[in-house]
């Protein structure tokens, strides 16, 4: 049950994360005009990965797409690429994870196959989340660099009297959406990987062998060095690690190095 819950939650968290990454990528507010000393502005500028917009005091908004590829900064192209890779990986991960969900039965799919698919989708979510976080962070770094550069030459004199006010840009809403979404996708991926461990049928290289002593039998289990008295169900030659499918409600106790008597 815990495995199913972890897997299901991982899927939902990743789904929300990827939706957020898509939303952030499409948003126009990656950078917004810095309203330093001027909270009310007649013309408000903001920019996204695909277009830049201007909103006037009337509410009239005009957006212009970046209709060039070669003319754009390499960093912007890199951010676009990272976000798209993140979306593609996330989408594939979602597709894979749907089939991997324990609560969904597809033909006679083995648990081992579901475990592998869960792990695959988990890794994809992790990489997707990292791509989004990296993309947003690169853009944020670019903004910080440009911000201080434009602050240094805020007013560039032109012929003494005339001044050109440089528009400074600061973090837009899309950056925060991207960071949160990337984090959620990453967390979802980790949860899927954790769920995979619970799904995977554990196999040992050894069969458990019972050594029959003259008095009463003691079964030595190679996995965990845990002695068991011969009374009860463990007196037969029985594999301690059952390779068969477990029910999802089964509480599995794995031997560990601390499990000794």
């Amino acid at each position: 049950m815990a495995v199913t819950a972890c897997q299901g939650l991982g899927f939902v968290v990743s789904l929300i994360g990827i939706a957020g990454i898509i939303a952030a990528t499409c948003m126009d507010q990656w950078s917004t005009q810095d309203l330093y000393n001027n909270p009310v502005t007649a013309v408000f500028n903001y920019q996204g990965l695909w277009r830049s917009c201007v909103r006037e005091s009337s509410g009239f908004t005009e957006c212009r797409g970046y209709f060039t590829l070669l003319g754009l900064p390499a960093m912007l192209q890199a951010v676009r690429a990272l976000m798209i890779v993140g979306i593609v990986l996330g989408a594939i991960g979602l597709l894979v994870s749907i089939f991997a969900l324990k609560c969904i039965r597809i033909g006679s799919m083995e648990d081992s196959a579901k475990a592998n698919m869960t792990l695959t989708s988990g890794i994809m979510f992790i990489v997707s989340g990292l791509c989004a976080i990296a993309g947003v962070s690169v853009f944020a770094n670019m903004l910080v660099t440009n911000f201080w550069m434009s602050t240094a030459n805020m007013y560039t004199g032109m012929g003494g009297m005339v001044q050109t006010v440089q528009t400074r840009y600061t973090f837009g809403a899309a950056l925060f959406v991207g960071w949160v979404a990337g984090g959620l996708t990453l967390i979802g991926g980790v949860m899927m990987c954790i769920a995979c461990r619970g799904l995977a049928p554990e196999e040992t290289n050894y069969k458990a062998v019972s050594y029959h002593a003259s008095g009463h039998s003691v079964a030595y289990k190679p996995g965990g060095f845990k002695a068991s008295t011969g009374f009860g169900s463990n007196t037969k030659n029985k594999k301690i690690y059952d390779g068969g499918a477990r029910t999802e409600d089964e509480v599995q106790s794995y031997p560990s190095k601390h499990d000794y008597v």
Epitope: Q33, N38, V40, T41, A42, V43, N45, Y46, Q47, S52, C53, V54, E56, S57, S58, G59, F60, E62, R64, V162, Q163, T164, V165, T167
Partner: antibody, heavy 119, light 113 residues
Framework: QVQLQQPGAELVKPGASVKLSCKAS????????MHWVRQRPGQGLEWIGM????????NYNGKFKSKATLTVDKSSSTAYMQLSSLTSEDSAVYFC????????????WGQGTSLTVSS | DIVMTQSPSSLTVTAREKVTMSCKSS????????????LTWYQQKPGQPPKLLIY???TRESGVPDRFTGSGSGTDFTLTISSVQAEDLAVYYC?????????FGSGTKLEIK
């Protein structure tokens, strides 16, 4: 058609206050900023400030911040500007103007109220 | 605040003549985001309120005759009347529409001979 109606003239004594009105019609009052502009006799235009009827949010020219107070009455589609502590310097024609949709322009103007401050 | 300087302060021309008037701003009115200049021109006839002629430095308001043309960018702007008519007798004001507080030029008075 868009109309901004203002009373023709107001006569007030120095030190008093006056509330100038501007009744809008022919458009959705709450969708556009309302600006106020002053023109002293034989002089140019000075922007006083603006108010958004929907939100009530205002933006003043620093020069008029302590002099003018902008308000609106949505029910009657009327904008008001209260001028306080009046002196002869405040004698001027006061225009209300609708903020245009494009270019931060002022696209429709009232006829103006001629304010005379005299004892 | 942005200071708007208009020149000349007055102009006397004959009908059907071409006239140009200048407006300079102390700061650039060009917005980098959309490459538009936030300068507006108004016409004020005697005893009337101002009337919007041109916004974005060169876009004519609907109903404004095409003899009125706005041009310029950054800090230097011009209003041209290609063929002056008697009804064009007025004071012409330019206005900074880029940043608050909005500021107006002192006006150019156009007189017809």
């Amino acid at each position: 058609q868009v109309q901004l109606q203002q009373p023709g003239a107001e006569l007030v004594k120095p030190g008093a206050s006056v509330k100038l009105s501007c009744k809008a019609s022919g458009y959705t009052f709450t969708s556009y900023w309302m600006h106020w502009v002053r023109q002293r006799p034989g002089q140019g235009l000075e922007w006083i400030g603006m108010i958004h009827p929907n939100s009530g949010s205002t933006n003043y020219n620093g020069k008029f911040k302590s002099k003018a107070t902008l308000t609106v009455d949505k029910s009657s589609s009327t904008a008001y500007m209260q001028l306080s502590s009046l002196t002869s310097e405040d004698s001027a024609v006061y225009f209300c103007a609708r903020g245009g949709y494009y270019g931060n322009s002022l696209d429709f103007w009232g006829q103006g109220t001629s304010l005379t401050v005299s004892s | 605040d942005i200071v708007m300087t208009q020149s000349p302060s007055s102009l006397t021309v004959t009908a059907r003549e071409k006239v140009t008037m200048s407006c300079k701003s102390s700061q650039s009115l060009l917005n980098s985001g959309n490459q538009k200049n936030y300068l507006t021109w108004y016409q004020q006839k005697p005893g009337q309120p101002p009337k919007l002629l041109i916004y974005w430095a060169s876009t004519r308001e609907s109903g404004v005759p095409d003899r009125f043309t706005g041009s310029g960018s950054g800090t230097d702007f011009t209003l041209t009347i290609s063929s002056v008519q008697a009804e064009d007798l007025a004071v012409y004001y330019c206005q900074n529409a880029y940043s608050y507080p909005f500021t107006f030029g002192s006006g150019t008075k156009l007189e017809i001979k």
